[in-house]
Amino acid sequence: IWELKKDVYVVELDWYPDAPGEMVVLTCDTPEEDGITWTLDQSSEVLGSGKTLTIQVKEFGDAGQYTCHKGGEVLSHSLLLLHKKEDGIWSTDILKDQKEPKNKTFLRCEAKNYSGRFTCWWLTTISTDLTFSVKSSRGSSDPQGVTCGAATLSAERVRGDNKEYEYSVECQEDSACPAAEESLPIEVMVDAVHKLKYENYTSSFFIRDIIKPDPPKNLQLKPLKNSRQVEVSWEYPDTWSTPHSYFSLTFCVQVQGKSKREKKDRVFTDKTSATVICRKNASISVRAQDRYYSSSWSEWASVPCS
Amino acid sequence: RNLPVATPDPGMFPCLHHSQNLLRAVSNMLQKARQTLEFYPCTSEEIDHEDITKDKTSTVEACLPLELTKNESCLNSRETSFITNGSCLASRKTSFMMALCLSSIYEDLKMYQVEFKTMNAKLLMDPKRQIFLDQNMLAVIDELMQALNFNSETVPQKSSLEEPDFYKTKIKLCILLHAFRIRAVTIDRVMSYLNAS
């Protein structure tokens, strides 16, 4: 058993049918010695008397808010949560496996640049009685500071019969140098509590591997005289690291017809302009990627050909 | 893919060109190592990230773009080092920091070159003959060093008398390639920045 926060305790339960459970001793936080009784949640059934209460925690029915009283007055509370292990594996029931980039991916993180700021998000089908708390650090043995905000509900989606909820959190490395070469990964730890169930999820990454630039901005077309060709120009996104000559991007320019089946023409360039043939009803899209370290491409920025 | 390059300052061009070749070569070698050594811990998640140049060179600090010198976090470990004359830049442009930066890059390349050559000698003794270093990568390191044209004592190749542990050598190769790729990215950024300024 360990303390999650004041008066909230997590009991680690290795569960299997007929498991003996964990013996837990609760102590009433009071100088009083006599006439103390214990109850669980809203029940008035007295579970025991005395300054300490010994319970055998075998299942969620044994978890909840234990309260010690004296003469009708509440002395203290202890909320017991369960962290369940089955077949040697800690439960991961609260969050959905996003399966990207690999199975058992519960947390996904992205950074728009090398400033040390990143966003992580996760999915759940649970809508109520749910709390998250997020901690992060650079490295784990001698951790350096990363400050995370509060997790917030960032999107709701309907998937068939199901509603899916997306939560996200923003974190910032306390002293980040954009040019630094990372040797220790960022560690992100999310504590999830649903009803009386505690679970924790972790992710470990280098900022360089989670870079996804914003799409190029100010995408413009300039028709070339007496030609079907157009000059496409764009700019680096505002959120990208500076100076741009050091943090350079490479770009992919795509001409796409109205139908998804039509052949796409693609050009790669390091410049912020390109000359392409504009077909009727087609659109031109440009996306960006770090020129030297191939992490994710940005989303597309698009303009119609007409 | 071939990266189109803007017409560079003729003084800087060889280094920019060679640094792009270097990044391409080390990335290809790393990809080959990950495929060939698929049953070894060779991915970024599995290896320990070691930097053989740590405390010996200060490339990131010495090559910091001017715009980032205002960032306190980038100046933590900034230290001065010896100055030598490099030929990548026309001499009128060679400032104290630039010379320091380029000499630091040269020292990095020299250190990695020695490590890779020592390692290759061991890998050639492996009866499995599973993986060797790409000669192209070694050649590209050499070309960039020549373009940088710094005078420096040659470091003798490390020789060891004991029987090599091929498993450990292959793990070390992965660690080295990952670190060298990260340094090659920094070198490429630096050359691009110097070329633009």
């Epitope: 049918p17 019969d161 509603k163 169930k197 | -």
Partner: nanobody, 123 residues
């Protein structure tokens, strides 16, 4: 929201068997831990058995262990309770429940309930 409908109850002789079914509709069935409870007239709701969302773990009340088997078919959105060696004291309304906590024998840990199906065991 999840809707639960029980079926399969009836009158049987002591020692006989019965299979109860609980069909779920609405939200994704495989997100829920499922349980069976029973309630005889004038008594509190009593836990019978529960099964985790994947169907890989089960949990039983001591009074039914070895006689009752809970199972589920996530493709059919159905949970079953196979009852054998029935006794007169098994007579009750059997209720199907869906929740998020497994294992739990406490009724208020379950969020959704069916209307129940009557099982009568005569001696």
């Amino acid at each position: 929201e999840v809707q639960l409908v029980e079926s399969g109850g009836g009158v049987v002789q002591a020692g006989e068997s019965l299979r109860l079914s609980c069909a779920a509709s609405g939200r994704s069935f495989s997100d829920y831990e499922m349980g069976w409870f029973r309630q005889a007239p004038g008594t509190e709701r009593e836990f019978v058995a529960s099964i985790n969302r994947r169907g890989s773990s089960t949990f039983y009340a001591d009074s039914v262990k070895g006689r009752f088997t809970i199972s589920r078919d996530n493709t059919k959105n159905t949970v079953y309770l196979q009852m054998s060696s029935l006794k007169p004291e098994d007579t009750a309304v059997y209720l199907c429940a869906a929740g998020w906590l497994f294992p739990s024998s406490r009724s208020r840990d379950y969020d959704y309930w069916g209307q129940g199906t009557q099982v009568t065991v005569s001696s």
